[in-house]
C-alpha cells in the first residue's frame, strides 16, 4: 500500500534456479532405412541449458536433422519452392526461408518434385510439424527451486525468499503454501490459466513474477515475496511472427574426415523470473 | 511528456528474439600442409548461441586453433616473450598473457626464435589479427525479429510490441515503418551512425533501446514502443582494455584415445535490448 | 545525496566482462582400472561459458561421470535406496532423487548391496562430495575486466566506467585504485568478507554492485561508479535447498554405434553485476 511519508526505493535482485525431474521419451527412430521404437531418458543435462539466473529453459519437444554435411542438395519443397527448369533458380540467391545458397540448377527432390539446388548443410532440414503430443510432455511434473536474494541499498537492507524455517520438500500452492519456492511446472501453467500439454508442443514463454512490497519501518516491518504467473508469448500470434518458443543448435562431429552435424530444433518453455517491488522507510 | 498528476510506474519487460539469415564464408584452409580455398555455409545454429531474451549474439568473424592437445610446447613469441636461455624462463610461472605454465626451459619456436616452454593446450593459439574483411561480413543482411511483452503490474496493464494488424514481411524503417519489429542488422548500425563492415572485424556491442512512454488514462490512451539504436562498446578503447567483442569457446573430441579440442575465438556483435519507460495513470 | 529540486532518472546499463587466467589442475584419473595422477591446464574456454553481460561464471570444481550410455543399471545406493527383493522396486516409478525409471527388478549394485534397476544414463552418477580442496582453487588469482556503459535517456547523457586516462594494467583496490575496473577474484571475496578457497568447493553467487550517483548539473557535475561486493547465495542454507552453486552439462559422442555422454557437474562462482543509481538534473 502507498505510504506517502515513506522514502521508496526499487529492489535490486539476484535469482538462482534449479530444475529437477526426468522425462521418458518414446519416438520412432529410423536407422539404415529401418524404423524402430526408440526409448530414452532425459535428465537436466539433456533438457536444460546453463542460462542466467533470471531465466531458465526447459526443452519439451524437438525435431532432429541428423548427419548433415556441407555439400549440394535440393532445397526442401515448401510451398512455392518447386521448380520445373533452371530458369526458376538464381545462382547466388539466398531465400530467407531457405537454408542455403542457390547454384542455379533445378534438380529432383524426390520421384515427383524438383527444387532448386543449394549449397547448404545437407540434407536440408525438413519443415515438418513439431511432434504432437510433445516428446517431453512429462516435463509438466518437473519442479523448479527458485532462490531470490534482494537488496535495498539505500536502506541497507537485504533478505531472501527462502527462510531457515522452510521445508525443502514443500511444493508451492497459492492457498496452502504461498511462501514455498519449489514450483511444479504444471502448477505454474494452471495458475496462469494455460494448458501445459498444449504449450509444450510449440513452446512458449512463461513469466514468474516475484513482487516484494516491503515496509522497512521497525514498528510495522513486513518484507515477503508474492508469486504470480502469466504467459508472456502471444498464443494468437500470426505464423509469420514465429509463434511459440524454439531455437536451433547443433552438435558437430567428424566421420571419415568429413565434418558433420546433428541439428536440433528445440521447442520448450522459457521461464522469465521478473522481480519487482519497492522498499519503503520513514 | 511529464503529467505530474499521474501515478507513474516503471515497465516490467520480457524479450524474445529470432535471428534469420545465412552467410557464405570463404577462407583459406590448411590440411596436411596443403592450403586450399574452403567454402562453407553458416546458418543460425552455426553463428548464434541460445542466449537470454534481452541479449543475442551474432558471430561475424573467427580465428580457429585446431587439434590442440594438452602437452608441452613453446609459447607464442609475442612482443617481449622471446628468450635466449633457460634463465629467462621461470618454472611454474603463469604469465597472464600466456596460455600455459612455464617449465623453466627455453626452446625453439621456429628456425629463428626461441620462447619459454609451457604446459598448455598445444600448439598454443597464435596471436594473429582477426581476418579482414570479416568472414561473416554478410551478416549485415541478417534480420532479427524482436518480440517484447510489457507489464505495469500496479496498473494491471499488459501489452506487446507486435499487434495482430502487423505484417510479418515488414522491415523496420525510422520513417516508413517505425512500428515494424523486424530489423535488418545493417540498418541498426546505419541508424546508430556506425559501419557494420568495420565493427564486424573485431566485434562490438550494439544497444537496441525500446522506450515505452505510456499514458494509460482511458481518455487519452497511448502505449506504443519507440526504437532507437546506439553503440555500447567504446570504439576508441585502448588495446589493453580489450576493444571490440569476442570470446573463446572450445569443441572437444577424442582421437587415438587423446582428448583434443578446437579452440574458436569468436568475434561478433552482441545486441543488448534495453527496455525502459513508464506507465502513467490518473 | 538527495537534491529534491532535481529530476531523477534511473540508470540504463550494459555490461561486458572478460575473464583472464589459467589454472593447473591435478587429480586422480582412472583408466582401464588403473588410477594415475592426471595433470591438466584450464584456460578461459575450459572454465567459463559465454553468458550474458550482467553475469559471468567461473568453474572452480567439478565431478565427472564419463562414458554414460542409455541402458539398464542399478541405481546409486544413497540412503534409503537399497532393496532386498523385487517387491521394493516399482516398474515405471521415477524417484525425484534418482536419475532413472525403475524396471521393477532388484539387482546387485556391488558385492554387498542391491538397489532397484533403472533405465537411465548408466552407470548412474555417484553422489560423491565435491573434491576438497577445489580442483580450480587457483581461480582466486584470475582477473575480470568489467566494462559498463550507462545511459540516462531522459537527460540524453551517456558515460562509461573506463576512461581514456585509465591504465590497463591496474588492479582494483578500495583505497589505492577505486576506479580501476580490473578485479582479482580473490580480492572481490576478501572485500565481501568471504573465503574464496572455501566457497570454491561447493560454488556460490557473488554480487558486484556498481552504484552510479550522478549529478548532471553542469556547475557541480559528478558521474563516476562506486564498486561494492556482497555474497548473494545463503551459506547457511539447509541441504534440501541445494547450497552453493552448480549445474550439470553433458558432452555427447558416439562410440561403437552407441550414443554416449560425459556428464559434468560444474561447481563455481556466478558473479552477478548489479548496476543501479540515478541521474539528477535541475
Amino acid at each position: 500500500s502507498d505510504k506517502l511519508y515513506q522514502r521508496k526505493e526499487p529492489v535490486i535482485s539476484s535469482v538462482h534456479t534449479k530444475v529437477k525431474g526426468i522425462a521418458e521419451v518414446t519416438e520412432n527412430v529410423t536407422e539404415g532405412g529401418v524404423t524402430k521404437l526408440g526409448h530414452s531418458i532425459f535428465d537436466t543435462a539433456d533438457y536444460t541449458f546453463p542460462l542466467q539466473g533470471n531465466s531458465f529453459f526447459v526443452m519439451t519437444n524437438y525435431v532432429k536433422s541428423e548427419g548433415q554435411v556441407q555439400t549440394l542438395c535440393p532445397e526442401y519443397p515448401r510451398r512455392g519452392a518447386q521448380c520445373s527448369s533452371d530458369r526458376r533458380c538464381k545462382k547466388g540467391w539466398m531465400d530467407p526461408q531457405s537454408k542455403g545458397i542457390q547454384t542455379g540448377r533445378c534438380v529432383p527432390y524426390d520421384k515427383t518434385r524438383k527444387t532448386c539446388e543449394v549449397s547448404a548443410w545437407c540434407p536440408t532440414e525438413e519443415e515438418k510439424e513439431a511432434p504432437r503430443p510433445a516428446l517431453l510432455r512429462s516435463a509438466e511434473n518437473f519442479t523448479v527451486l527458485i532462490k531470490n536474494n534482494i537488496h535495498f541499498p539505500g536502506h541497507n537492507y537485504t533478505t531472501r525468499n527462502i527462510l531457515p524455517t522452510m521445508n525443502g520438500s514443500c511444493t508451492f500452492h497459492k492457498t496452502w503454501d504461498p511462501q514455498c519456492s519449489i514450483f511444479r511446472l504444471g502448477d505454474i501453467f494452471q495458475e496462469a490459466g494455460e494448458n501445459f500439454t498444449e504449450v509444450a508442443v510449440q513452446g512458449g514463454i512463461m513469466g514468474i513474477e516475484i513482487y516484494w512490497d516491503c515496509n522497512l519501518d521497525s514498528w510495522s516491518h513486513h518484507c515477503r515475496p508474492r508469486y504470480s504467473f502469466r504467459r508472456l508469448d502471444d498464443k494468437n500470434m500470426d505464423e509469420s511472427f514465429v509463434p511459440g518458443y524454439n531455437f536451433r543448435y547443433a552438435k558437430y562431429y567428424k566421420e571419415n574426415n568429413v565434418e558433420k552435424r546433428t541439428l536440433i530444433k528445440a521447442f520448450g518453455i522459457r521461464f522469465d523470473i521478473l522481480v519487482f517491488g519497492t522498499g519503503g522507510k520513514f | 511528456s511529464d503529467k505530474l498528476y499521474q501515478r507513474k510506474e516503471p515497465v516490467i519487460s520480457s524479450v524474445h528474439t529470432k535471428v534469420k539469415g545465412i552467410a557464405e564464408v570463404t577462407e583459406n584452409v590448411t590440411e596436411g600442409g596443403v592450403t586450399k580455398l574452403g567454402h562453407s555455409i553458416f546458418d543460425t545454429a552455426d553463428y548464434t548461441f541460445p542466449l537470454q531474451g534481452n541479449s543475442f549474439f551474432v558471430m561475424t568473424n573467427y580465428v580457429k586453433s585446431e587439434g590442440q592437445v594438452q602437452t608441452l610446447c613453446p609459447e607464442y613469441p609475442r612482443r617481449g616473450a622471446q628468450c635466449s636461455s633457460d634463465r629467462r624462463c621461470k618454472k611454474g610461472w603463469m604469465d597472464p598473457q600466456s596460455k600455459g605454465i612455464q617449465t623453466g626451459r627455453c626452446v625453439p619456436y621456429d628456425k629463428t626464435r626461441k620462447t619459454c616452454e609451457v604446459s598448455a593446450w598445444c600448439p598454443t593459439e597464435e596471436e594473429k589479427e582477426a581476418p579482414r574483411p570479416a568472414l561473416l561480413r554478410s551478416a549485415e543482411n541478417f534480420t532479427v525479429l524482436i518480440k517484447n511483452n510489457i507489464h505495469f503490474p500496479g496498473h494491471n496493464y499488459t501489452t506487446r510490441n507486435i499487434l495482430p494488424t502487423m505484417n510479418g514481411s515488414c522491415t523496420f524503417h525510422k520513417t516508413w515503418d517505425p512500428q515494424c519489429s523486424i530489423f535488418r542488422l545493417g540498418d541498426i548500425f546505419q541508424e546508430a551512425g556506425e559501419n557494420f563492415t568495420e565493427v564486424a572485424v573485431q566485434g562490438g556491442i550494439m544497444g537496441i533501446e525500446i522506450y515505452w512512454d505510456c499514458n494509460l488514462d482511458s481518455w487519452s490512451h497511448h502505449c506504443r514502443p519507440r526504437y532507437s539504436f546506439r553503440r555500447l562498446d567504446d570504439k576508441n578503447m585502448d588495446e589493453s582494455f580489450v576493444p571490440g567483442y569476442n570470446f573463446r569457446y572450445a569443441k572437444y573430441y577424442k582421437e587415438n584415445n587423446v582428448e583434443k579440442r578446437t579452440l574458436i575465438k569468436a568475434f561478433g556483435i552482441r545486441f543488448d535490448i534495453l527496455v525502459f519507460g513508464t506507465g502513467g495513470k490518473f | 545525496s538527495d537534491k529534491l529540486y532535481q529530476r531523477k532518472e534511473p540508470v540504463i546499463s550494459s555490461v561486458h566482462t572478460k575473464v583472464k587466467g589459467i589454472a593447473e589442475v591435478t587429480e586422480n584419473v582412472t583408466e582401464g582400472g588403473v588410477t594415475k595422477l592426471g595433470h591438466s591446464i584450464f584456460d578461459t574456454a575450459d572454465y567459463t561459458f559465454p553468458l550474458q553481460g550482467n553475469s559471468f561464471f567461473v568453474m572452480t570444481n567439478y565431478v565427472k561421470s564419463e562414458g554414460q550410455v542409455q541402458t539398464l543399471c542399478p541405481e546409486y545406493p544413497r540412503r534409503g535406496a537399497q532393496c532386498s527383493s523385487d517387491r521394493r522396486c516399482k516398474k515405471g516409478w521415477m524417484d525425484p532423487q534418482s536419475k532413472g525409471i525403475q524396471t521393477g527388478r532388484c539387482v546387485p549394485y556391488d558385492k554387498t548391496r542391491k538397489t532397484c534397476e533403472v533405465s537411465a544414463w548408466c552407470p548412474t552418477e555417484e553422489e560423491k562430495e565435491a573434491p576438497r580442496p577445489a580442483l580450480l582453487r587457483s581461480a582466486e588469482n584470475f582477473t575480470v575486466l568489467i566494462k559498463n556503459n550507462i545511459h540516462f535517456p531522459g537527460h540524453n547523457y551517456t558515460t562509461r566506467n573506463i576512461l581514456p586516462t585509465m591504465n590497463g594494467s591496474c588492479t582494483f583496490h578500495k583505497t589505492w585504485d577505486p576506479q580501476c575496473s580490473i578485479f582479482r577474484l580473490g580480492d572481490i571475496f576478501q572485500e565481501a568478507g568471504e573465503n574464496f578457497t572455501e566457497v570454491a568447493v561447493q560454488g556460490g553467487i557473488m554480487g558486484i554492485e556498481i552504484y552510479w550517483d550522478c549529478n548532471l548539473d553542469s556547475w557541480s557535475h559528478h558521474c563516476r561508479p562506486r564498486y561494492s561486493f556482497r555474497r548473494l547465495d545463503d551459506k547457511n542454507m539447509d541441504e534440501s535447498f541445494v547450497p552453493g552453486y552448480n549445474f550439470r552439462y553433458a558432452k555427447y559422442y558416439k562410440e561403437n554405434n552407441v550414443e554416449k555422454r560425459t556428464l559434468i557437474k560444474a561447481f563455481g562462482i556466478r558473479f552477478d553485476i548489479l548496476v543501479f543509481g540515478t541521474g539528477g538534473k535541475f
Partner: nanobody
Framework: EVQLVESGGGLVQPGGSLRLSCAAS????????MAWYRQAPGKQRELVAD???????NYADSVNGRFTISRDNVRNTVYLQMNGLKPEDTAVYYC??????????????WGQGTQVTVSS
C-alpha cells in the same frame, strides 16, 4: 522368440587362442549387459567377463590380461577373445544377456553353451 546363439568353441592346445561369439536374435527393444560364464565339470558356473552397453568391462582374476570381451551393438553380438589358453580354462562357456523385450521389460537370457577344451 529371443535367442542367444553361441559359436567358436572347440579343441585347442595350451597357449593357443579361440574367439567365441554370441548373437542375440528375435524381436526385442534393446540389448543391455552381456557376459560370458563358464562351468567346468563338477564345478559351479562362474563369471568370466561382462560388458555393459557402454563397453565397460569386468574380468575374473583368473583370465585378466589373457581374455578380452567386446561387443558389436549393430549386430547385437558379444565376443570373447581367449589368448594364452590353459588346461584349467576347459569348460562349457555360456553367453548371458539382459534384453529388454519392450521398454522397461528386461529378461535375463542364456545361450545353450559351447565347449572349450584346452589339451595337448
Amino acid at each position: 522368440e529371443v535367442q542367444l546363439v553361441e559359436s567358436g568353441g572347440g579343441l585347442v592346445q595350451p597357449g593357443g587362442s579361440l574367439r567365441l561369439s554370441c548373437a542375440a536374435s528375435g524381436s526385442f527393444f534393446r540389448v543391455n549387459n552381456m557376459a560370458w560364464y563358464r562351468q567346468a565339470p563338477g564345478k559351479q558356473r562362474e563369471l568370466v567377463a561382462d560388458i555393459t552397453r557402454g563397453d565397460r568391462t569386468n574380468y575374473a582374476d583368473s583370465v585378466n590380461g589373457r581374455f578380452t570381451i567386446s561387443r558389436d551393438n549393430v549386430r547385437n553380438t558379444v565376443y570373447l577373445q581367449m589368448n594364452g589358453l590353459k588346461p584349467e580354462d576347459t569348460a562349457v562357456y555360456y553367453c548371458y544377456a539382459t534384453i529388454e523385450l519392450g521398454v522397461l521389460e528386461p529378461r535375463d537370457y542364456w545361450g545353450q553353451g559351447t565347449q572349450v577344451t584346452v589339451s595337448s
